[in-house]
Interface confidence: low
Amino acid sequence: QDKPFLSAWPGTVVSEGQHVTLQCRSRLGFNEFSLSKEDGMPVPELYNRIFRNSFLMGPVTPAHAGTYRCCSSHPHSPTGWSAPSNPVVIMVTGVHRKPSLLAHPGPLVKSGETVILQCWSDVRFERFLLHREGITEDPLRLVGQLHDAGSQVNYSMGPMTPALAGTYRCFGSVTHLPYELSAPSDPLDIVVVGLYGKPSLSAQPGPTVQAGENVTLSCSSRSLFDIYHLSREAEAGELRLTAVLRVNGTFQANFPLGPVTHGGNYRCFGSFRALPHAWSDPSDPLPVSVTGNSRHL
């Protein structure tokens, strides 16, 4: 008997209170199916029901977490049903408070290098899951290290490629609640850098300004970058602007920093919309210094 294929949309990780669509596809074209849940709490809305094409399940509660299979109608089988489909594990998030996700040494990772993702919590989670946005396959399951202050896991990821870059979140769970997850950590953007040639960075009116004076940093390149990212050393996050084609054939973005009070080392990167987590080499660092201010960074 042909096994049908069960899938979950938008994915297998579902926030408590949200909905998930379970779709059972038969290669033979039969669109009626039954659903069963293999473990955990029973889900009465599945019992003795025939679904057509798909089933919108929700709003989900922790009781919906577990392993699902479907059987499609199969008139040529003795039972009238196909063999059970592949298993789909639905994980429900929001059951525990969120962990924190950090990148060491930082979220900008040179192509080919390794980054350590650290997920930690003051809750003693024995298991952590690492999930990349836009990926439908199951999250990566990691064993947590328990300690007095809570729990953590370190995951070494590399060598870095555009395929590994993206927006990551982690979740915590405890052994006996395998499919009930914490709320997601705040998102962490892991970016692979060094894929394209470096842009140029300059300052107007210049890299040395009076305290309170306006300064604009311009990032430009002959590469067809859609977006430029400006980062300041020792600061998380970056400014992001769309590139504009200039008369001289360069693609440029101007970052108005406004009235500056503190200096710092700035770098910029270029990237393409189609690959938002893959950036160029960094520009040469541009030290911006502020005079008439006792504090220089």
Epitope: D39, G40, M41, P62, A63, A65, G66, V95, H96, V123, R124, E126, L146, V174, T175, H176, L177, P178, Y179, E180
Partner: antibody, heavy 121, light 98 residues
Framework: QAYLQQSGAELVRSGASVKMSCKAS????????MHWVKQTPGQGLEWIGY????????NYNQKFKGKATLTADTSSSTAYMQISSLTSEDSAVYFC??????????????WGQGTLVTVSA | SMYASLGERVTITCKAS??????LSWFQQKPGKSPKTLIY???RLVDGVPSRFSGSGSGQDYSLTISSLEYEDMGIYYC?????????FGGGTKLEIK
Amino acid sequence: QAYLQQSGAELVRSGASVKMSCKASGYTFTSYNMHWVKQTPGQGLEWIGYIFPGDGGTNYNQKFKGKATLTADTSSSTAYMQISSLTSEDSAVYFCARSGYYGNYEGFAYWGQGTLVTVSA
Amino acid sequence: SMYASLGERVTITCKASQDINSYLSWFQQKPGKSPKTLIYRANRLVDGVPSRFSGSGSGQDYSLTISSLEYEDMGIYYCLHYAEFPYTFGGGTKLEIK
């Protein structure tokens, strides 16, 4: 139907160790956490910790770290708890209790009948 | 201890030190016996437990209600929170016939 059979009462000298057992039947031993709980008239019920026989992973209440050691023998579907350096404060009834596979929604789904430990001077 | 008459509605309460997200169980224990789980996840009745038992609550405050007390309901009732480690039991409430 899951069933947990605990070993018999123990009378032990102060300073010695005691190892009690909890034999599981009626379910897959390696798929469920086995918790241990202490009961005394003075302190009521206290959670000691648990072992996951599937991989031997343990999680202890800090209060019992170094005092209790949890182990499991998958070949005989038996969980063990050893209590060391016994004092009169360790005189209690000790229960093993199995969690639910999914969700520990049940808190502790099944309980053993308890093992009475009496520590003598 | 708590005293109640047969047929009476009885409510026992349990307060957690923080929000435990309904990870709370109720147990009944009779002298010389092991505890018996009645309610899990704050309000879900264990199979085989009479429907006169019910649980409610959220956040930090939870309660166990017996809608009509029967003689066999005498015993000590404990709550357990299992939202995170270490799991913690309440001190117990002894329910006796008035």
